[in-house]
Amino acid sequence: VQYAPEPSTVQILHSPAVEGSQVEFLCMSLANPLPTNYTWYHNGKEMQGRTEEKVHIPKILPWHAGTYSCVAENILGTGQRGPGAELDVQYPPKKVTTVIQNPMPIREGDTVTLSCNYNSSNPSVTRYEWKPHGAWEEPSLGVLKIQNVGWDNTTIACAACNSWCSWASPVALNVQYAPRDVRVRKIKPLSEIHSGNSVSLQCDFSSSHPKEVQFFWEKNGRLLGKESQLNFDSISPEDAGSYSCWVNNSIGQTASKAWTLEVLYAPRRLRVSMSPGDQVMEGKSATLTCESDANPPVSHYTWFDWNNQSLPYHSQKLRLEPVKVQHSGAYWCQGTNSVGKGRSPLSTLTVYYSPETIGRR
């Protein structure tokens, strides 16, 4: 018995199909004689150029998903379109992006919220991954909260995952922060600082964002300069003190550790002081003290009389006891340290006779 094709059914090898795989559709319809022509439909729309019993798609794409149906035709007539078959195409999440929810710019210490967005996914996204890994909070699926963001948190990337994970391009957090690792560096001299030296100090820092910075130098809390270098053409002992530098940008300012600048100098401002005074009665005691200002302190003293004769005393104090009238005259001292020598002006000691001596005369 010959008859026109009966309503057709579609068999799919295989559904669900993974994106990129191949799929074959078979149109089955009882007919005698066998169908000679087929019309294929995808979601109700005729597929152009497909007239065979089998349709082969070598590389399936997400848009190939949907209902496939067919109509068979022989010399006796055209069959009816059956209910068709559903092709499910599975694929990783598409167009994944990491989105920063915060207003820009982000500053060190801020709380940063990021979301992981995607365009489509089959099957549904069930989890998210983040790079780098951190002890960060995920308040909800696809949302990351970074509390107290660090200056060195540079980029973050997320992945949306179903059976596969799709990674977004990393997003730059561009965290802004105050200058870091601010330090004073002595450029010149590389050795100890002597009075009269040319001295250069540099204010260094390792990084800053934004890069535009200002420098401030201070000594004992007083502002000295606003350049990265602090220069002394000829340093003096009065320049000694506690120095620090500050670097600031629009986010904040950072200070270096304080550094005590020490100036070494030969003994200066020497003077001979006399006790109990510069007029002493014979027989009493007179103490001459060599007072000076030196760094390092004076290590060696030399005493001289009015004839520039050195005296056999090398301590800071010269004690004359009992003092004699012959001790009257001008004295001076010389102080020596590792830097050099300094001398005092002359100081005159007057020794007068005692009443007893005058009485005997």
């Epitope: 330090r183 550790k257 550094w259």
Partner: antibody, heavy 125, light 108 residues
Framework: EVQLVQSGAEVKKPGESLKISCKGS????????IAWVRQMPGKGLELMGI????????TYNPSFQGQVTISADKSISNAYLQWSSLKASDTAMYYC??????????????????WGLGTLVTVSS | EIVLTQSPGTLSLSPGERATLSCRAS???????LAWYQQKPGQAPRLLIY???SRATGIPDRFSGSGSGTDFTLTISRLEPEDFAVYYC?????????FGQGTKVEIK
């Protein structure tokens, strides 16, 4: 990244002249001293001298004074070590290094970091 | 000039062991101005310690420095395979700055 890149290995004859270079990058070259250090085959490290590119002030180790010349060109971030007349005993690896440091408290520290990879100089007839 | 003498010349140890390297100065090194460097074959030296005891950036805490005056020590608490190298001390307290002759730490 702070880097010092040194010129390539040299093979010379005794009596010839030579100038090797060290190029700094990733920092303000003019504000850091550069040191030159010699290491003879199988031996230890010897500081030859240092230069401040900002004004080309140079300090030589007395052992090397008059034997070599250290110079710098801050405009191209280069430091140089040169010989006017090489000897076989100049055969060695020569390193340049940045003199880093900082001051705090009452101290000022200095150190060599980073170092170039070295230039091997071979002097042989 | 200050002469630095390192001892021993060679130290033969196994990974995991403790290494103690000595550096003695011919005169006192002011303010502990002493640094330590590590040099592996075919490589440039690398800064480990400055100021006798401060670790340089990125140096593992198994490296420690101590000492003052004329006697200084570098200690590696547990030797790792990458620690076998030559170690140099260097003073920067007085001019000219000088290096010790080095201590080689080799695998036993």
């Amino acid at each position: 990244e702070v880097q010092l890149v040194q010129s390539g290995a040299e093979v010379k004859k005794p009596g010839e002249s030579l100038k090797i270079s060290c190029k700094g990058s990733g920092y303000n070259f003019a504000t850091y001293w550069i040191a030159w250090v010699r290491q003879m085959p199988g031996k230890g490290l010897e500081l030859m001298g240092i230069i401040y590119p900002g004004d080309s002030e140079t300090t030589y180790n007395p052992s090397f004074q008059g034997q070599v010349t250290i110079s710098a060109d801050k405009s191209i971030s280069n430091a140089y070590l040169q010989w006017s007349s090489l000897k076989a005993s100049d055969t060695a690896m020569y390193y340049c290094a940045r003199v880093g440091g900082y001051c705090s408290g009452t101290s000022c520290h200095n150190w060599f970091d980073p170092w170039g990879l070295g230039t091997l100089v071979t002097v042989s007839s | 000039e200050i002469v630095l003498t390192q001892s021993p010349g060679t130290l033969s140890l196994s990974p995991g062991e403790r290494a103690t390297l000595s550096c003695r100065a011919s005169q006192s090194v002011s303010s502990s101005y002493l640094a330590w460097y590590q040099q592996k074959p075919g490589q440039a030296p690398r800064l480990l310690i400055y100021g006798a005891s401060s670790r340089a950036t990125g140096i593992p805490d198994r490296f420690s420095g101590s000492g003052s005056g004329t006697d200084f020590t570098l200690t590696i608490s547990r030797l790792e395979p990458e620690d076998f190298a030559v170690y140099y001390c260097q003073q920067y307290g007085s001019s000219p700055w000088t290096f010790g002759q080095g201590t080689k730490v080799e695998i036993k």
